[in-house]
C-alpha cells in the first residue's frame, strides 16, 4: 500500500434534510474487506465504530457535520467529505413567492423570494429534482432569488427554507410549494439555472455571490459548503432524492 | 427468533393492564433492534400502540400516550407493557414484535394473548 | 399524524390469479413501508419490507412496489393459502399507523 487508504463515501438516506421525529440512516462506504469503520459527529466526542448510524427520531442535538474512515490493519483511510445533516422543522415555515408571478414567459425574468417572520440571516430554495441548494443570507427577514432569462428547465416546484447563521444546522419547516410554470418554450435543457443571476441593486451583495454548481458543493466568494441530499439506494428504506439549492455563505 | 406474550385474560374497567413480552434469538441490547406493541380487536384491524428501542428510546400512540409505559428488563430478554384504567373498548388480542432498523418493519411476531374487559 | 389507505377493503378471486392490493399515504414515506398477511386466529406475518424488499422465505411470486405515497403489493398466480388479510404499515416518524386491511377471500 503506497499512500493513504482513499476516502470512504457517507450518505443519509433517504435525505440529509430530516424533518424533527423522522428516521435517518447516516452510512460509510469503504472498500469492500473494512477491519473497522468510525462514524464521527464533529464539535462533539460523539463516534461509533460501526458503518451505520441509525436514527429513529431526528432530535435538535443530532444537527450537524458528520464524517467517517476506516481502518485496515495499522492504516487509517483519509476522512469522508463532511456529510451535513439538517435538521427541519425547527421553526415555522417561510413563505415563498414570485415576482412578478408564478407563470413567466420563456426568455422572460422571474424572482422568487422566501419571507419569513422570525429575524433569520440564511435561506435555502430548493427545486425538486435538481442537485445542489442556494444560499443566501439577507438584513431585511426576505431572501430574493433571481432567475435571469428563464428557460423551460427552470419549471418546477420550489420551496424555501430559513434558518440562522448561528445555529445552521436547525432550519424552518419547507414553505408551502410554489409551482413556476414557464409558458411558450418546448425546447428543455438538462441543467439549470442555464447562467448565474446577474446581481440586483437591492441585494447585491448577496446575489453577487450566487454560483450554481452541478456537483453536490456549493461555493462562495467566501466559503465552500457541501449540502447533499442522498440518492436512493435499492436495498435501502430510502426515497427519491430530494435536491437543494442554496446562495450566498 | 421467537417472542411469546403473557397477560392476565380478563380485566374488570379502571383495572391496570401489565403485559411481559418474552423473547429469544436476539437481544434487545443489540444495536438497532427494538420491540413493539399492536393490537387487534375481533375482526378489526391492527393498531400500533408503542415500542422501545436498544437505547432505551421509547414511542407511544400519541391516543393512548397517557396511559401507556412501555419498560425493558434486557438481561431476561423482556419487555412490558402497562395500560392504565382499561374499559371495553381495550379488549382485543395483543401482539408484541420485534423491529429492525434496517428493514424498518417488524419482522418477527408473538402469537399474541387475549384481554377481554369486562364488569 | 400519517394517515394510510388501503385498497379493495375486500377482494375475491381464484387460484392462479393475480390480484393487486394499493396502500397510499396521506404524505411522503419514502420507502418506509411493510406488508403483512394474516390468517384467521394466526398473528400477522412479515411479507415485504422498505417497500420493495422480499422478506425470509417469502414466495417470489409476492412483490412490492412503490415509493413516497402510493404503494401496492402484488400476488401473480394466486395460491390457496394465499388467502387472507394484508395490511401495509409505514414506518416514517411515530405514530405508525396501518392501513386499514384488505380481506382477500376465495371466489
Known amino acids: 500500500q503506497s499512500g493513504p487508504l482513499p476516502k470512504p463515501s457517507l450518505q443519509a438516506l433517504p435525505s440529509s434534510l430530516v424533518p424533527l421525529e423522522k428516521p435517518v440512516t447516516l452510512r460509510c462506504q469503504g472498500p469492500p474487506g473494512v477491519d473497522l469503520y468510525r462514524l464521527e459527529k464533529l464539535s462533539s466526542s460523539r463516534y461509533q465504530d460501526q458503518a451505520v448510524l441509525f436514527i429513529p427520531a431526528m432530535k435538535r442535538s443530532l444537527a450537524g457535520r458528520y464524517r467517517c474512515s476506516y481502518q485496515n490493519g495499522s492504516l487509517w483511510s483519509l476522512p469522508s467529505d463532511q456529510l451535513e445533516l439538517v435538521a427541519t422543522g425547527v421553526f415555522a415555515k417561510p413563505s415563498l413567492s414570485a415576482q412578478p408571478g408564478p407563470a413567466v414567459s420563456s426568455g422572460g425574468d422571474v424572482t422568487l423570494q422566501c419571507q419569513t417572520r422570525y429575524g433569520f440571516d440564511q435561506f435555502a430554495l430548493y427545486k425538486e429534482g435538481d442537485p445542489a441548494p442556494y444560499k443566501n443570507p439577507e438584513r431585511w427577514y426576505r431572501a430574493s432569488f433571481p432567475i435571469i432569462t428563464v428557460t423551460a428547465a427552470h419549471s418546477g416546484t420550489y420551496r424555501c427554507y430559513s434558518f440562522s447563521s448561528r445555529d445552521p444546522y436547525l432550519w424552518s419547516a419547507p414553505s408551502d410549494p410554489l409551482e413556476l410554470v414557464v409558458t411558450g418554450t418546448s425546447v428543455t435543457p438538462s441543467r439549470l439555472p442555464t447562467e448565474p443571476p446577474s446581481p440586483v441593486a437591492e441585494f447585491s451583495e448577496a446575489t453577487a455571490e450566487l454560483t450554481v454548481s452541478f456537483t453536490n458543493e456549493v461555493f462562495t466568494t467566501e466559503t465552500s459548503r457541501s449540502i447533499t441530499a442522498s440518492p436512493k439506494e435499492s436495498d435501502s428504506p430510502a426515497g427519491p432524492a430530494r435536491q437543494y439549492y442554496t446562495k450566498g455563505n | 427468533v421467537t417472542l411469546k406474550e403473557s397477560g392476565p385474560g380478563i380485566l374488570q374497567p379502571s383495572q391496570t393492564l401489565s403485559l411481559t413480552c418474552s423473547f429469544s434469538?436476539?437481544?434487545?441490547?443489540?444495536?438497532?433492534?427494538?420491540v413493539g406493541w399492536i393490537r387487534q380487536p375481533s375482526g378489526k384491524g391492527l393498531e400500533w400502540l408503542a415500542h422501545?428501542?436498544?437505547?432505551?428510546?421509547?414511542y407511544y400512540n400519541t391516543a393512548l400516550k397517557s396511559r401507556l409505559t412501555i419498560s425493558k428488563d434486557t438481561s431476561n430478554n423482556q419487555v412490558f407493557l402497562k395500560i392504565a384504567s382499561v374499559d371495553t373498548a381495550d379488549t382485543a388480542t395483543y401482539y408484541c414484535?420485534?423491529?429492525?432498523?434496517?428493514?424498518?418493519?417488524?419482522?418477527?411476531w408473538g402469537q399474541g394473548t387475549t384481554l377481554t374487559v369486562s364488569s | 399524524d400519517i394517515q394510510m389507505t388501503q385498497s379493495p377493503a375486500s377482494l375475491s378471486a381464484s387460484v392462479g390469479e393475480t390480484v393487486t392490493i394499493t396502500c397510499r399515504a396521506s404524505?411522503?414515506?419514502?420507502?418506509?413501508l411493510a406488508w403483512y398477511q394474516q390468517k384467521q386466529g394466526k398473528s400477522p406475518h412479515l411479507l415485504v419490507y422498505?417497500?420493495?424488499n422480499l422478506a425470509d422465505g417469502v414466495p417470489s411470486r409476492f412483490s412490492g412496489s412503490g415509493s413516497g405515497t402510493q404503494f401496492s403489493l402484488k400476488i401473480n398466480s394466486l395460491q390457496p393459502e394465499d388467502f387472507g388479510s394484508y395490511y401495509c404499515?409505514?414506518?416514517?416518524?411515530?405514530?405508525?399507523?396501518f392501513g386499514g386491511g384488505t380481506k382477500l377471500e376465495i371466489k
Open positions: 422501545i428501542w436498544w437505547d432505551d428510546n421509547k
Open positions: 404524505e411522503n414515506i419514502y420507502s418506509y
Open positions: 404499515q409505514h414506518f416514517y416518524g411515530t405514530p405508525w399507523t
Open positions: 422498505a417497500a420493495t
Open positions: 414484535a420485534r423491529i429492525h432498523y434496517y428493514g424498518s418493519s417488524l419482522d418477527y
Open positions: 434469538g436476539f437481544s434487545l441490547s443489540t444495536y438497532g433492534i427494538g
